[in-house]
Amino acid sequence: KAMHVAQPAVVLANSRGTASFVCEYASPGKATEVRVTVLRQADSQVTEVCAATYMMGNELTFLDDSICTGTSSGNQVNLTIQGLRAMDTGLYICKVELMYPPPYYMGIGNGTQIYVIDPEPCPDSD
């Protein structure tokens, strides 16, 4: 069976440029090692935002310099992307790969449109 990945259609980043969403997957097998990748699609270009590999039951660990953080619970991954600006508005795709044991399975969500609005600068006070 194909692996289905679900994620919300739209998310609005908060005033600090942080957006969170849940990426949920229906696992066809009993994976012990899972890789989660967030991709950004702009026009027809796809770029990797961040990626993390984790062992089932353990915490999700992104690289220290990553703009993403996350937690995992069963077949759900709670993803948070920080430091977003208005120019980062776009479609963010969650990809899940069951890396081990074989067979390998891959699933791609339909994407979450993240809207980012830069905060208005505070007016000067006399």
């Epitope: 289905h4 090692e33 991709l39 796809v46 590999t53």
Partner: antibody, heavy 120, light 108 residues
Framework: QVQLVESGGGVVQPGRSLRLSCAAS????????MHWVRQAPGKGLEWVAV????????YYADSVKGRFTISRDNSKNTLYLQMYSLRAEDTAVYYC?????????????WGQGTLVTVSS | EIVLTQSPGTLSLSPGDRATLSCRAS???????LAWYQQKPGQAPRLLIY???SRATGIPDRFSGSGSGTDFTLTISRLEPEDFAVYYC?????????SGPGTKVDIK
């Protein structure tokens, strides 16, 4: 631009070994899954093996499992295929291919291929 | 493993004709995780379509893909001389990554 250049092919006797190399350039090698795909003369495409980003996970086609070993050296941007106990049916053009960023099982760039002939 | 069947084996057409190539999966495990490749004699394959319907970079819009589940189609709206080649479908949703036997599009 993305470039993949295979080398190491040639004529080898049944039961012998051969190592293929694939030199990659034009992209961040360590961020991509890499594959070997082969094509026997006049036949279709057969996926052989994949090695994931960090080199920890490797999968093989049943036809080569236990005889072929895929590996990578991210510091040298090079992919390898060590082939042992070669058989006549392993005769093929061997291509190295990059896995796509959207899905690692998509072969988005290919090398020109290297011919392996197993014959006595 | 997922077995892919392509039909017809050979398609004899003229430049300007419309080509319709079929690919059927033995199970729906491929979902929309299906790609199409073009291969010309003496050359490596080239990615045309991924995700059943998305064109790869630089692929002309006369190439289009459709389908989901087990039945997929590659359509070439108007054949150009350079389009006469062998076309392979491939599923990438699960290992092993399997390909169809190919459809040869040749000049009538």
């Amino acid at each position: 631009q993305v470039q993949l250049v295979e080398s190491g092919g040639g004529v080898v006797q049944p039961g012998r070994s051969l190592r293929l190399s694939c030199a990659a350039s034009g992209f961040t090698f360590s961020s991509y899954g890499m594959h070997w795909v082969r094509q026997a003369p006049g036949k279709g495409l057969e996926w052989v093996a994949v090695i994931w980003y960090d080199g920890n996970n490797k999968y093989y086609a049943d036809s080569v499992k236990g005889r072929f070993t895929i590996s990578r050296d991210n510091s040298k941007n090079t992919l390898y295929l060590q082939m042992y106990s070669l058989r006549a049916e392993d005769t093929a053009v061997y291509y190295c291919a990059r896995g796509g960023i959207l899905a690692a099982g998509i072969f988005d760039y290919w090398g020109q291929g290297t011919l392996v002939t197993v014959s006595s | 493993e997922i077995v892919l069947t392509q039909s017809p084996g050979t398609l004899s057409l003229s430049p300007g004709d419309r080509a319709t190539l079929s690919c059927r999966a033995s199970q729906s495990g491929s979902s929309s995780y299906l790609a199409w490749y073009q291969q010309k004699p003496g050359q490596a394959p080239r990615l045309l379509i991924y995700g059943a319907s998305s064109r790869a970079t630089g692929i002309p819009d006369r190439f289009s893909g459709s389908g989901s589940g087990t039945d997929f189609t590659l359509t070439i709206s108007r054949l150009e001389p350079e389009d006469f080649a062998v076309y392979y479908c491939q599923q990438y949703g699960t290992s092993p990554f399997t390909s169809g036997p190919g459809t040869k599009v040749d000049i009538k």
